[in-house]
């Protein structure tokens, strides 16, 4: 069956090192787990994580992000899943695609991160 | 080097369980899942399921769901495979192979020798 | 379901000569299709993955092309080694594999 693709609907914001939690879901609503599940970022649609055929396709996911991103699924089975990545990043900022995919049906939403730093608020002098 | 060493052959009564064990060696057991595939005699290779060696998760195909069960024991690098209500279309080689995901793709890098269950009254 | 089918189901040849098979896909599998190879009594081997790239030790006179639907294994210059049955696979939705080429000695 068909779905939407629903991000948060605004920027998530997250401190330099801290982790960030991109949350995606599907609607209407239903079991994604048989499902492939992904973020990619332009330009070059980058792989940041991919779970396709019940796993993580760590092979596919770019270097940058290699043991940095965690696919959030304690509630895949109503098609909400989350984007955890850790240890943030400046060149993280920026736009990045969700999507689902059932068999050759696939539909995506964009989410915006916004990393601030800790200290920007210090007085060096 | 890697390698994969299953359980010798089989010879079951329809209804029955069998479980095949499949041993790795040459290289770190809980980095990389194990797939099990089977082989019908003078047939093609049919995909079973799926462990996480890791996490001890699972995903079954729909044809074996409720019948199979894929464990493991990290402490002997072994990864175990039952089936159950055993009939004589199960008569096959059963083939343990090791899960590439982490490093090259979604593929079998690595295959066991292969096990012959036999399954007849 | 996905269904992957291959052709021809035997394929007669001489060393030296060079192989085709075909591998078709029911649905467009993108690139996730790699290619085994079995012979008798043994195992099947990792040949090729994501429809092209030749995996370790796999010698060169291997090669695979396609994308989508369509996807072929070409071995050139066939040793006697090469004789053997192939299977295609694919993993872009769980897992299927065809139902082989038998690549026998003319």
């Known amino acids: 069956g068909q779905f939407r693709v629903i991000g948060p609907g605004h920027p998530i914001r997250a401190l330099v090192g801290d982790e960030a939690e991109l949350p995606c879901r599907i609607s209407p609503g239903k079991n994604a787990t048989g499902m492939e599940v992904g973020w990619y970022r332009s330009p070059f649609s980058r792989v940041v994580h991919l779970y396709r055929n019940g796993k993580d396709q760590d092979a596919e996911q770019a270097p940058e992000y290699r043991g940095r991103t965690e696919l959030l699924k304690e509630s895949i089975g109503e098609g909400k899943v989350a984007l955890r990545i850790q240890n943030v990043r400046f060149s993280d900022e920026g736009g990045y695609t969700c999507f689902f995919r059932d068999h050759s049906y696939q539909e995506e939403a964009a989410v915006e991160l916004k990393v601030e730093d800790p200290f920007y608020w210090i007085n060096p002098g | 080097q890697v390698q994969l060493v299953q359980s010798g052959a089989e010879v079951k009564k329809p209804g029955a369980s069998v479980k095949v064990s499949c041993k790795a060696s040459g290289y770190t057991f809980t980095s990389y899942g194990m797939q099990w595939v089977r082989q019908a005699p003078e047939q093609g290779l049919e995909w079973m399921g799926w462990?996480?060696?890791?996490?001890?998760?699972?995903s079954y195909a729909q044809k074996f769901q409720g019948r199979v069960t894929m464990t493991r024991d990290a402490s002997t690098s072994t990864a175990y495979m039952e089936l159950s209500s055993l009939r004589p279309e199960d008569t096959a080689v059963y083939y343990c192979a090791r899960d590439a995901t982490r490093i090259l793709a979604d593929v079998l890098d690595y295959w066991g020798q292969g096990t012959l269950v036999t399954v007849s009254s | 379901e996905l269904t992957l089918t291959q052709s021809p189901v035997t394929l007669s040849l001489s060393p030296k000569e060079t192989a085709t098979l075909s591998c078709r896909a029911s649905q467009s599998v993108r690139s996730y299709l790699a290619w085994y190879q079995q012979k008798p009594g043994q195992a099947p081997r990792l040949l090729i993955y994501g429809a092209s790239t030749r995996a370790t030790g796999i010698p060169a006179r291997f090669s695979g092309s396609g994308s989508g639907t369509d996807f072929t294994l070409t071995i050139s210059s066939l040793e006697p080694e090469d004789f053997a049955v192939y299977y295609c696979q694919q993993y872009s939705s769980w897992y299927t594999f065809g139902q082989g080429t038998k690549l026998e000695i003319k």
């Open positions: 462990i996480n060696t890791n996490t001890g998760g699972t």
